[in-house]
């Protein structure tokens, strides 16, 4: 399955929008920094086949979408930027979904790497618990925004590697 060119453009747009969403200086939140232990090995395109990598990407974007779709998120960000960001993620989900469905239909496709899906889920669990622990403070959201920019960058790079594999 070939992801459309618009997909990588959407990915870049999402990153730009997330960058614009910052409301406070990251320097004022240095004491709130946290290592969420991004599962970098799950973004190593050489580690698994394309079908599996796309499932991991889908999980990553889906969890990001869910994280920014909460009431707490709505209260934290400027509404129009948040809506645009969510729209970009939603479009990416649709592209990835179509690819995963296509791969599911191919009988010889190896089973999804369930531990990779779980690693992504655990990563977002750490982020969720951090926000709860910090009572969804502006600095906590700023730290999370910066972290999600990192993870979206990893996603973008993985997609580039997948396209090169083609």
């Amino acid at each position: 399955c070939d992801l459309p060119q618009t997909h990588s453009l959407g990915n870049r747009r999402a990153l730009i929008l997330l960058g614009q969403m910052g409301r406070i200086s990251p320097f004022s939140c240095l004491k709130d920094r946290h290592d969420f232990r991004i599962p970098q090995e799950e973004f190593d395109g050489n580690q698994f086949q394309k079908a599996q990598a796309i499932s991991v990407l889908h999980e990553m974007i889906q969890q990001t979408f869910n994280l920014f779709s909460t009431e707490d998120s709505s209260a934290a960000w400027e509404q129009s930027l948040l809506e645009k960001f969510s729209t970009e993620l939603y479009q990416q989900l649709n592209d990835l979904e179509a690819c995963v469905i296509q791969e599911v239909g191919v009988e010889e496709t190896p089973l999804m790497n369930e531990d990779s899906i779980l690693a992504v889920r655990k990563y977002f669990q750490r982020i969720t618990l951090y926000l709860i622990e910090r009572k969804y403070s502006p600095c906590a959201w700023e730290v999370v925004r910066a972290e999600i920019m990192r993870s979206l960058s990893f996603s973008t790079n993985l997609q580039k590697r997948l396209r090169r594999k083609d």
Epitope: S55, Q62, Q63, N66, L93, L96, L118, Q125, R126, L129
Partner: antibody, heavy 119, light 108 residues
Framework: QVQLQQPGAELVKPGASVKLSCKAS????????MHWVKQRPGQGLEWIGE????????IYNENFKSKATLTVDKSSITAFMQLSSLTSEDSAVYFC????????????WGQGTLVTVSA | QIVLTQSPAIMSASPGEKVTLTCSAG???????LYWYQQKPGSSPKLWIY???NLASGVPARFSGSGSGTSYSLTISSMEAEDAASYFC?????????FGSGTKLEIK
């Protein structure tokens, strides 16, 4: 509010199959994995597996791979679990439960369907 | 798979008594992925405690959770009649996800 609706009971004959349903409402169905859990009378809970309604990918507990098949119908926002070659060991209450994170993990359960396997 | 062993299987407590239920894991479980559910007869389980020590919405403050590694517990500081139920621990630290066999807590 989030709701997962399951039929109350199913009576099936040994060797037959049954398809259980779990109709979701109150949230975007495709955004969360749906899980299935088995509970035999007076016993503990067993995780059967999960399905992502967005694309249909499944992850199973090895113990149930040859017993259960998970599917979804996005148009009717319903998750299904087919149980095959039923025996008395399959007589149990089967719950669907929605995934999530933090305080949303298995925060929403269906009422459960009691499956009775009897001749 | 990670086997969760709960003890005792059944226990009864008087109103006002302190109660501790334990959950022992066959191998180490990260505390972020250890949950507790309450279930009353004829009902589906209810999320009670998430990530070892966080109370779910609506759970009375007399409940608390603690633990790490292979040893976890749920404590009720002062037993009340409405606390009579079965309690299950659950882990999603690794596949397949597992539940404990449960502790049935009765009121004396």
């Amino acid at each position: 509010q989030v709701q997962l609706q399951q039929p109350g009971a199913e009576l099936v004959k040994p060797g037959a199959s049954v398809k259980l349903s779990c109709k979701a409402s109150g949230y975007t169905f495709t955004n969360y994995w749906m899980h299935w859990v088995k509970q035999r009378p007076g016993q503990g809970l067993e995780w059967i597996g999960e399905i992502n309604p967005s694309h249909g990918r499944t992850i199973y507990n090895e113990n149930f791979k040859s017993k259960a098949t998970l599917t979804v119908d996005k148009s009717s926002i319903t998750a299904f679990m087919q149980l095959s070659s039923l025996t008395s060991e399959d007589s149990a209450v089967y719950f669907c439960a929605r995934g999530g994170l933090g305080p949303a993990w298995f925060a929403y359960w269906g009422q459960g369907t009691l499956v009775t396997v009897s001749a | 798979q990670i086997v969760l062993t709960q003890s005792p299987a059944i226990m009864s407590a008087s109103p006002g008594e302190k109660v501790t239920l334990t959950c022992s894991a066959g191998s180490s479980v990260d505390s972020s992925y250890l949950y507790w559910y309450q279930q009353k007869p004829g009902s589906s389980p209810k999320l009670w405690i998430y990530s070892t020590s966080n109370l779910a919405s609506g759970v009375p403050a007399r409940f608390s959770g603690s633990g790490s590694g292979t040893s976890y517990s749920l404590t009720i500081s002062s037993m009340e009649a409405e606390d009579a139920a079965s309690y299950f621990c659950h882990q999603w630290s690794s596949y397949p996800f597992t539940f404990g066999s449960g502790t049935k807590l009765e009121i004396k």
